[in-house]
């Protein structure tokens, strides 16, 4: 097809040789077309113009991407020739950086429903350059963490060395959707929730006397649980006495909840106190019985083959510990009457 009618956009990707980083291209079809298309439109359905030159399709993956070889050969279908480039709905993901990604990328709808649709396409001229050493040494990472429940910020890597006053107007996207209220080089998050994670894209325009182009950077943001500030708590046993039958086997379970820690070295053990003596008991291995995003429950059992009179005089103590501190719960055995 003839690409001379495609709208054109120039983009610059300056990648750091020190870190892994990704890049994305959006299929930025002209606004009316896009409204029926990739769900990246800024119009609500009621605002869509009545007479659209391109009727599009609601199938989010109904876009074809091509690369234009520099030698003038025919357009190449991205999916067939470039394994390090993946199409996800209307977005093209570049998984690895490199100057070999430079080139012209064209997207257009797969379904052509009217003669007007032939020109419904976008040509993106991508220039890829490694970051020079002269660039800012402490630029923001392309992988940024936000601590759940606290205040945080997401910085645009290509602008993080500039003060807010110097910074040009920035366009931000999150998971391909425009964040229309964000215009500075930093997004401030008052309270971090898990839905703040995702792929953020920041764009700003740079110009010289000849032309202007969009400088783009991609930031992978993840939300992480902060290390616990609490020592573990023992969920079971709750009572400090336990009724037992003499001569019968007995299992006492200790279940303790440990808050999340990146470096996790939980301790859970049983020991016995008998008058002035105390000793650790050799018991089966501890096992994790529950793991959530914020905590983990570990269980360790003490097994008595048969309860003796001597056991009634002892205290069985469950001891648990993390990097913050320790907790104990003791159990005194009491003979069942009747």
């Amino acid at each position: 097809f003839n690409i001379s009618g495609c709208s054109t956009k120039k983009l610059l990707w300056t990648y750091s040789t020190r870190s892994e980083e990704e890049f994305v291209l959006f299929c930025d079809l002209p606004e009316p077309q896009k409204s029926h298309f990739c769900h990246r439109n800024r119009l609500s359905p009621k605002q869509v113009p009545e007479h659209l030159p391109f009727m599009g399709s609601n199938d989010l993956s109904d876009v074809q991407w091509y690369q234009q070889p520099s030698n003038g050969d025919p357009l190449e279908d991205i999916r067939k020739s470039y394994p390090h480039i993946i199409q996800d709905k209307c977005t093209l993901h570049f998984l690895t950086p490199g100057v070999n990604n430079s080139g012209s990328y064209i997207c257009r709808p797969k379904m052509i429903k009217s003669p007007y649709d032939v020109a419904c396409c976008v040509k993106m001229i991508l220039e890829v350059k490694p970051q020079t050493n002269a660039s800012c040494e402490y630029s923001a990472s392309h992988k940024q963490d936000l601590l759940l429940g606290s205040t945080g910020s997401i910085s645009c890597p290509s602008l993080s060395c500039q003060s807010d006053a110097q910074s040009p107007a920035v366009t931000w996207y999150k998971n391909g959707k425009l964040l229309s209220v964000e215009r500075s080089n930093r997004i401030v998050v008052d309270e971090v929730y898990d839905y703040h994670q995702g792929t953020y894209v920041c764009d700003y325009t740079q110009s010289d006397t000849v032309s202007s182009w969009t400088v783009r950077a991609v930031v992978q943001v993840r939300t992480i649980v902060g290390d616990t500030k609490l020592k573990p708590d023992i969920l079971d046993p709750v009572e400090d006495t336990l009724e037992v039958e003499l001569g019968k086997p007995l299992t006492i379970s200790c279940k303790a909840r440990f808050g999340f820690e990146r470096v996790f070295n939980p301790v859970i053990k049983w020991y016995i106190k008998d008058s002035d003596l105390e000793w650790e008991v050799s018991v089966p291995e501890a096992k994790s019985i529950k793991s959530t995003l914020k905590d983990e429950i570990i269980e360790r059992n003490i097994i008595l083959e048969k309860v003796t009179q001597r056991d009634l005089r002892r205290k069985f103590v469950c001891f648990v510990q993390n990097s913050i501190g320790n907790t104990t719960q003791s159990v005194q055995l009491k003979e069942k009457r009747g």
Epitope: Q197, K290, S291
Partner: antibody, heavy 115, light 111 residues
Framework: SLEESGGRLVTPGTPLTLTCTVS????????ISWVRQAPGKGLEWIGH??????AYYASWAKGRFTISRTSSTTVDLKMTSLTTEDTATYFC????????????WGQGTLVTVSS | AAVLTQTPSPVSAVVGGTVSISCQSN????????LSWYQQKPGQPPKFLIY???TLASGVPSRFKGSGSGTQFTLTISDVQCDDAATYYC???????????FGGGTEVVVK
């Protein structure tokens, strides 16, 4: 987003591995659950892979099902000794807090076990 | 093993009316509130409605209300709409993950 793959028609006794591929989700800070639904029946929680990559299972699923994080974007569900009772749509979903609190779901992949 | 018993299906509701679905557990859920509710329509994955027994998930209308703690929980839909016709599931999390389970589901029919 999450996408399940690998569902197909198999004969009883055949092992099968399903894959949940995530995008825009980091498995270092997100846990993934597997849930299944037999045709016309209710939902069944199979188990989950936590943020450290450890697996936890419903009591009925222990032994025959294995959940493992196979890469930074994939979580597998391996099933052995399949019977006709295992015919179902298998969903993967992101855990939001506790493990049956699932806020993002894939569309599911159908596994049919038939002789 | 844990068992979650839901109101038997189907439950009828009238547009503009109120409908309640109960979910009973044979043992306490984790933290007494680790119970979620889901809505499912034919051919679709479940939709997350309520978590921690009573907190509404993002984007869920305030017509949906969850209540209860420990072993007894209720989902109430007020000002019922035609679009609320679906099957609703409760899901419980327990002190041991091996007990985690869904309820059997309750179909809500809107007239």
């Amino acid at each position: 987003s999450l996408e399940e793959s690998g569902g197909r028609l198999v004969t009883p006794g055949t092992p099968l591995t399903l894959t949940c591929t995530v995008s825009g989700i980091d498995l270092i800070s997100n846990a993934i659950s597997w849930v299944r639904q037999a045709p016309g029946k209710g939902l069944e929680w199979i188990g989950h892979s936590d943020i450290r990559g450890s697996a936890y299972y419903a009591s009925w699923a222990k032994g025959r099902f294995t959940i493992s994080r196979t890469s930074s974007t994939t979580v597998d569900l391996k099933m052995t000794s399949l019977t006709t009772e295992d015919t179902a749509t298998y969903f993967c979903a992101r855990i939001a807090d506790v493990n049956t609190q699932l806020d993002l779901w894939g569309q599911g992949t159908l596994v049919t076990v038939s002789s | 093993a844990a068992v979650l018993t839901q109101t038997p299906s189907p439950v009828s509701a009238v547009v503009g009316g109120t409908v309640s679905i109960s979910c009973q557990s044979n043992k306490n859920v984790y933290d007494n509130n680790a119970l979620s509710w889901y809505q499912q329509k034919p051919g679709q994955p479940p939709k997350f409605l309520i978590y921690r027994a009573s907190t509404l998930a993002s984007g869920v209308p305030s017509r949906f209300k969850g209540s209860g703690s420990g072993t007894q929980f209720t989902l109430t839909i007020s000002d019922v709409q035609c679009d609320d016709a679906a099957t609703y599931y409760c899901a419980g999390d327990y002190i041991s993950d091996s007990d985690n389970t869904f309820g059997g589901g309750t179909e809500v029919v809107v007239k």
